[in-house]
Amino acid sequence: MAERAALEELVKLQGERVRGLKQQKASAELIEEEVAKLLKLKAQLGPDESKQKFVLKTPKGTRDYSPRQMAVREKVFDVIIRCFKRHGAEVIDTPVFELKETLMGKYGEDSKLIYDLKDQGGELLSLRYDLTVPFARYLAMNKLTNIKRYHIAKVYRRDNPAMTRGRYREFYQCDFDIAGNFDPMIPDAECLKIMCEILSSLQIGDFLVKVNDRRILDGMFAICGVSDSKFRTICSSVDKLDKVSWEEVKNEMVGEKGLAPEVADRIGDYVQQHGGVSLVEQLLQDPKLSQNKQALEGLGDLKLLFEYLTLFGIDDKISFDLSLARGLDYYTGVIYEAVLLQTPAQAGEEPLGVGSVAAGGRYDGLVGMFDPKGRKVPCVGLSIGVERIFSIVEQRLEALEEKIRTTETQVLVASAQKKLLEERLKLVSELWDAGIKAELLYKKNPKLLNQLQYCEEAGIPLVAIIGEQELKDGVIKLRSVTSREEVDVRREDLVEEIKRRTGQPLCIC
């Protein structure tokens, strides 16, 4: 026993040593050796101990979905997919892991969040970080120059997530992208329209879509005196303006990123501005910005974009925001991000954003990175942040104490007397064959009260009750669970009656 206690203490001490070495950023070899020692100590503790100490949980940043949560998720997905299909998108799927090389150099500062897989004999693999880079790889690999597609799948990020705010290490993304050479800003405007349609349909509250352009950002940095090598890192600082004050952002740019204070001030004059098409017009007149070719192109495109957004009837939902600087390296043109707004405490206050629920932009160079000849396929797309939306919908339903059905069963086949299992089995089979969603209790002689109670709990609207008399008369008693009203229906009419009552089309098409 003393030996076991000593080993346990050694495991604890060795664990602390390993953590300490990692914090001190000790050499990889030393860490590797000390981890190997820790594993050898743990092995000496034997299997019993590890079973005892094993905590049953999902890995950090992941979660299970209960039937209730899945019901919410499927409703959200249904809204999104119907919208994507309404806009004529095809669907694709790609592997959950990619060659590490495919993902390298595409995400800038976020590359450190990519999950690498242990070597499985030759290929260095990483879990996908998003759906956009795999899409670009798919286009290049299949030599496609034209596609409108959606893709709904899980992605993986080695983040330190605040799961309470709907942030995870494994999460779904719902992406819609248009690839191809088209006239400026028409596909971009459609992407913004789709974003607004989905967020409106989901009824998760008021939202605002911030829009900017990478070319405007780059042009602005150039005229403010930021060196090319610092563009991306300064971008990531500016992008924090929705969360922290300008003072904090400026301190980061000057203190941590080595920007001259006067350069930071010049940037501040621009990035604190937001508005509509009038701000675009104003900046087109800006003596310095209008002299920059990149910025001028960006502003011209944004002006055109606002025209199309007005025609689509969504210009009131869009704000031109110079602080929007989406972190990903691959954006080349228009960028956008949708945020939910909290209702202001007092009228006249600025609406307050509570986090991004959708985002996207134009990435004209990404496919070219995979093409041996560097041939570009212009692309624009959007991604719906469904995990955050799931969280919001779940919270809203909890607040309303709304009961969510987790099954779609239309009818329970029940019996009022004993010894009718065979009849119940025959009837439920008939209903299944006719495309009716039906269930029965797995008991030979269930009590009628228990069967009715099951319907109440599961939200099943109808009960088809078989009795000896009904069998003789060739009818089935069809009972509405909520109103408790019962009618006798001829057996041959039962399918049609259930379909009529549950609003299901009369043929399975």
Epitope: A6, L7, E9, L10, L13, Q14, E16, R17, E29, E33, A36, K37, K40, L41, Q44
Partner: antibody, heavy 120, light 107 residues
């Protein structure tokens, strides 16, 4: 019972070489980190070198690095110390020692020691 | 390298006495400390590991305590066979270093 027996010590001239051996028995040798620890006459103890169970990791004190080489043969349950360019200050009793709980750098089993004398 | 300093260098005591030897590390070593006993012409023998764990077969009159930089070996009631030299050793980081030793003599 655990037994460690050193051999190979003796008198050698400065600049000369010696190879110490340690024969292990009574335990699963291939599971354990092993080390050489020395003690100059009338002085304290000094950890010289260690080698991991599968020979992946080895370390030496600054005083001997580049001159001494630790190695092991798990098939023969043997530990070795090849000593080159020997100096007068290397004169000591050399102990072969086993790590505690296979990997903890505390010697829980020692040999009887072998004396190395470096003198002209 | 981590320096280990033992005190006193030598101590005279009688059978039945309680004796305390201290060992100080030049920097924090958590509990990575061991105590050894060595008799003339013999190899050292492990008494205590990770500051306070008694090696099997070692009499319970020996005990160890401390963590960080300051450690103590206590012999609660000296027996004739306990007269020897005692060494502390840090196992925190290589090179693993020993104290200079404390010689326990009969008064």
């Amino acid at each position: 019972q655990v037994q460690l027996v050193e051999s190979g010590g003796g008198l050698v001239k400065p600049g000369g070489s010696l190879r110490l051996s340690c024969a292990a028995s009574g335990f699963t040798f291939s599971d354990y980190y092993m080390s050489w620890i020395r003690q100059a006459p009338g002085k304290g103890l000094e950890w010289v070198s260690y080698i991991s169970d599968k020979s992946r990791y080895t370390k030496y004190t600054d005083k001997v690095r580049g001159r001494f080489t630790i190695s092991r043969d798990n098939a023969k349950n043997s530990l070795y110390l090849q000593m080159n360019s020997l100096r007068a200050e290397d004169t000591a009793v050399y102990y072969c020692a086993r790590y505690l709980y296979q990997v903890i750098a505390i010697a829980d089993a020692w040999g009887q020691g072998t004396l190395v004398t470096v003198s002209s | 390298d981590i320096q280990m300093t033992q005190s006193p260098s030598s101590v005279s005591a009688s059978v039945g006495d309680r004796v305390t030897i201290t060992c100080r590390a030049s920097q924090g070593i958590s509990s990575w400390l061991a105590w050894f006993q060595q008799k003339p012409g013999k190899a050292p023998k492990l008494l205590i590991f990770v500051a306070s764990n008694l090696e099997s077969g070692v009499p319970s009159r020996f005990s160890g305590s401390g963590s960080g930089t300051d450690f103590t070996l206590t012999i609660s009631s000296l027996q004739p066979e306990d007269f020897a030299t005692y060494y502390c050793q840090q196992a925190e980081s290589f090179p693993y270093t020993f104290g200079q030793g404390t010689k326990l003599e009969i008064k």
